[in-house]
């Protein structure tokens, strides 16, 4: 008799894909527009990135440390009306983009929880979670917590008005700490919250840091949703060079828990390689003609029009990945086992059940290296076969869907690749 | 069940001031979401003015902004409106209304479970 199907475990919209983080409306436009009608006008763009949420703004008004002049509940005239809002809204539903409504309230000022009026902020807070739900946003993010003095309580209460709303309605929080224990602290008190924070941040050194940052988030979370991001806000080239970002593009894809991106990483939007533009929030690279500061400054590989037409580029990879990842069920739920590969790597099977599996392997070094995949570390359930076909690699040049043989494996620097097998009996 | 009882209007002339009010019943007045709306005649009820549960957080139509004034007195139970400016095309009847689920009342008028009978204002030029 054939064995019995594993129960599919309950999955939230926010479980089944990536979120993509708009923090700076103006500058992800660029041309000195900047509101929500044009934003409306580049969701197509969203859905083929295949991003399940759109984390947005903050968008609402707010004279940079003057809380009277902070209001939650009113979105700033450069951005637009609430009825551009209304209409964003209908407009993403209709492709099946959730918004999420960024409320981090003093975001044009020096502390972004106006540290002497806790109280009458986070009361500002919960009344724009009433007033926000009913306007149909499908959650909120807040940021800079570790700013908010007893994070953990205002957490738990507006967690509660969230969920309370609706099960299918999700908040996230925002810290710079890269600190595990106040991570952790911050995840006790509240069982659904989703926490963007800097801990993989400082993680680009080498596979085995990686490894061992991974692996000891994931045991002390035990089986709560994680997401997966370098920092709550910023670009993943602030953190990773150039030869990285495919790497651990293929990383945040493939790790169990949500992937977080900013506008841009797809690309590999670098606000170094364009003079006079913010690290926070560099203009969007749409086409040559979105940086006019300096002619020649932007090549059309480094563009969202270039990258589209060529196969072998980062938007491409990312695409890829991300179709992979909202429809592969050892991809959205599947259980992770990290083993040893050698120095210099990082490897991990996922698995569901009968369910196509997938090994990762990812070499962050900068020489090529053979794989000692170490399947005596893995349990019964998650065993490696002799050979896995090869779905993608990070670099050009490997024949797609050829089987490897993992006894032989061998990658190119930075090279990560993400491999197929099916489930044996 | 909350009932609630508008009373303030009348007859004014154009860029003269009202204020409206609404008390409600019941203990729990603290924990509404409450709001303003009014009906021209022939026309569809529109939002006016919205206001949350402790009387923080206001949210106004974007055509009354700065005219209109939505306040409450928690320990009155009631909930108030001042207009200033008055124009003709301010002439309905104003209702007040009661969102017993959320602490922030919205725009829509479908998420509000109680209403008032209502409470007409003339404005003539």
């Known amino acids: 008799r054939a064995p019995r199907c594993r129960e599919l475990p309950a999955q939230k919209w926010w479980h089944t894909g990536a979120l993509y983080r708009i923090g700076d409306l103006q500058a992800f436009q660029g041309h000195g527009a900047g509101n929500l009608a044009g934003l409306k006008g580049r969701l197509d763009y969203l859905s083929s990135l295949k991003v399940k949420g759109l984390v947005l703004g903050p968008i609402h008004k707010n004279q940079k440390d003057d809380v009277a002049q902070t209001d939650l509940l009113q979105i700033d005239p450069n951005f637009g009306s609430k009825e551009d809002f209304d209409s964003l809204l209908q407009s993403a539903k209709k492709k099946s983009i959730r918004v999420i409504l960024d409320l981090t309230p003093n975001y044009r000022g020096e502390n972004s929880w106006f540290s002497t009026q806790v109280d009458t902020v986070a009361t500002k807070v919960k009344d724009a979670l009433e007033f926000w739900l009913q306007a149909g946003v499908d959650g909120f993010q807040v940021r800079d917590i570790e700013n908010l003095k007893d994070a953990s309580s205002f957490l738990a209460e507006w967690q509660n008005i969230t969920k309370g709303f609706s099960e299918d309605r999700l908040l996230i929080a925002g810290t710079n700490s890269s600190d595990l224990q106040q991570i952790l602290s911050l995840l006790e008190s509240n069982k659904d919250l989703l926490l963007t924070s800097s801990y993989l941040s400082d993680s680009g050194s080498t596979g085995e840091h990686t490894k061992s940052l991974v692996t000891q988030y994931l045991n002390a979370t035990g089986n709560r949703w994680c997401s997966w991001s370098l920092s709550q806000a910023r670009l993943l080239t602030s953190f990773l060079p150039a030869q990285l970002l495919r790497l651990y593009q293929l990383m945040l894809f493939t790790l169990p828990g949500t992937p977080v991106f900013s506008y841009g990483d797809e690309i590999g939007l670098d606000a170094a390689a364009l003079p006079g533009q913010p690290m926070e929030a560099p203009v969007m690279l749409w086409d040559e003609s979105s940086f006019p500061d300096i002619p020649g400054a932007v090549s059309a590989n480094m563009t969202v029009k270039g990258q589209s037409e060529d196969p072998g580029s980062l938007l491409s990879l990312f695409r890829r990945l991300s179709d992979q990842r909202s429809k592969e069920r050892s991809l959205l739920h599947g259980d992770f086992h990290a083993f040893s590969a050698g120095p210099g790597l990082f490897s991990y099977i996922r698995h569901w059940d009968q369910n196509e599996r997938f090994l990762v392997v990812l070499n962050f070094g900068d020489v090529g290296l053979s794989a000692g995949l170490q399947a005596s570390d893995l349990p019964a359930s998650a065993s490696l076969p002799a050979k896995a076909d090869l779905l993608l690699s990070t670099q050009p040049g490997r024949e797609e869907g050829s089987p490897l043989e993992l006894e032989r494996l061998k990658l190119e620097p930075h090279e990560g690749l993400l491999l197929r097998f099916p489930y044996a009996a | 069940q909350v009932q609630l009882v508008e009373s303030g209007g009348g007859l004014v002339q154009a860029g003269g001031s009202l204020r409206l009010s609404c008390a409600a019943s019941?203990?729990?007045?603290?924990?509404?979401?409450m709001g303003w709306f009014r009906q021209a005649p022939g026309k569809e009820r529109e939002f006016v003015a919205t206001?949350?549960?402790?009387?923080?957080?206001?949210y106004y139509a974007d055509s009354l902004k700065g005219r209109f004034t939505i306040s409450r007195d928690n320990a009155k139970n009631t909930v108030y409106l001042q207009m200033n400016s008055l124009k003709p095309e301010d002439t309905a009847v104003y209702f007040c209304?009661?969102?017993?689920?959320?602490?922030?009342?919205?725009?829509?008028?479908?998420?509000?479970?109680?209403w008032g009978q209502g409470t007409q204002v003339t404005v003539s030029s």
């Open positions: 209304a009661a969102d017993t689920r959320h602490c922030m009342g919205y725009t829509k008028d479908g998420g509000y479970a109680y």
């Open positions: 019941g203990r729990t007045f603290s924990r509404y979401g």
């Open positions: 206001i949350s549960c402790s009387g923080t957080s206001t």
